[in-house]
Amino acid sequence: PQIFNKSNDGFTTTRSYGTVSQIFGSSSPSPNGFITTRSYGTVCPKDWEFYQARCFFLSTSESSWNESRDFCKGKGSTLAIVNTPEKLKFLQDITDAEKYFIGLIYHREEKRWRWINNSVFNGNVTNQNQNFNCATIGLTKTFDAASCDISYRRICEKNAK
């Protein structure tokens, strides 16, 4: 079957069946704003959701990909890297019927999609177009190519404290 691999580099194909270990991000900025306890002493800022030692923020406002990236950076976070099945299911459970920018961009010179931590995305991005170099999730079960200049919602993520 097709499963996520364990090397934190997005999606891959393996020959044997298996389960997937929990994989966490490596950056650890401190949350800002009002802190609320979430689980076993870990905390996320107000309006952020806790999952597997990470905090996630889903915007209701919309902006371009660059503005979204900067918004997340300003909150001590990054656009979400959706590289485990656990994280994918969690995000499908909490995203409204809207499109959300994530941290996945097309590198035209390489002709490949990469997460913003530079790891390779080995899945398939739908709706590809020569002018669509950013990606969204939500609304559908797929990773959809999108214009980086169109305004969509965003998902930010960072380590829980």
């Epitope: 079957p1 891959t12 889903l58 398939n124 739908t126 797929t142």
Partner: antibody, heavy 116, light 113 residues
């Protein structure tokens, strides 16, 4: 911890309607899809629909469209399902469950009996 | 609608034995974009609500013992219990979460000898 507490059993007449509640606690109610599932002995489990409380967006199984109505009250973190024009086929246990497509947390179920 | 078919409808085993149950879907549950199979497994103990065991065919829900193993792809899926325990007495349901309406199999009743 995540909890979904459903309202008690209902005995209702054919042709009438019933409204079941599901009180959520232990998580951000507005930010998670909440589904409803019907279980009849010998008929297995049947997905009715789901709601995103933050926006009120809903999806329905065509089999229940027009008869089932899903709503959510953000202030009380309670979701509701109303089913109208009840028949004996609607006698079942109804569950609320958190999630968009697969469900990790379930209410304890509400038994609805439709009888004259 | 996608039809889910489970087999066998019931089985009885002794504690420690290996259990295998099947679930077949009327169309592929494989998502080409994210490379996951949208198939979940639940068990439901007598008088209780269903409990999620597995999603994406092979990803164990948090807290589920590792004796539960999900496998398969496309239309054919299997839930294996490597060494059945007395507390595993339950009805087991598969569910496709690929497209609406999400549909469930008829269930496999596991009895302990």
């Amino acid at each position: 911890q995540v909890q979904l507490q459903q309202s008690g059993a209902e005995l209702v007449r054919p042709g009438t309607s019933v409204k079941i509640s599901c009180k959520a606690s232990g998580y951000g109610f507005n930010n998670y899809w909440l589904g409803w599932v019907k279980q009849r002995p010998g008929h297995g489990l049947e997905w009715i629909g789901d709601i995103y409380p933050g926006s009120g967006n809903t999806y329905y199984n065509e089999n229940f469209k027009g008869r089932a109505t899903l709503t959510a009250d953000k202030s009380s973190t309670t979701a509701y399902m109303q089913v109208s024009s009840l028949t004996s086929e609607d006698s079942a246990v109804y569950f609320c469950a958190r999630g968009k497509e697969s469900f990790a947390y379930w209410g304890q179920g509400t038994l609805v009996t439709v009888s004259a | 609608d996608i039809v889910m078919t489970q087999s066998p409808s019931s089985l009885a085993l002794s504690v420690g034995q290996k259990v295998t149950m099947s679930c077949k879907s009327s169309q592929s549950l494989f998502n080409f974009s994210n490379r996951n199979n949208y198939l979940a497994w639940y068990h439901q103990k007598p008088g209780q609500s269903p409990k999620l065991l597995m999603y994406f065919a092979s990803t164990r829900e948090s807290g589920v013992p590792d004796r539960f193993i999900g496998s398969g792809s496309g239309t054919d899926f299997t839930l294996t219990i490597s060494s059945v325990q007395a507390e595993d007495l339950a009805d087991y349901f598969c569910q496709q979460h690929f497209t609406t309406p999400y549909t469930f199999g008829g269930g496999t009743k596991l009895e302990i000898k």
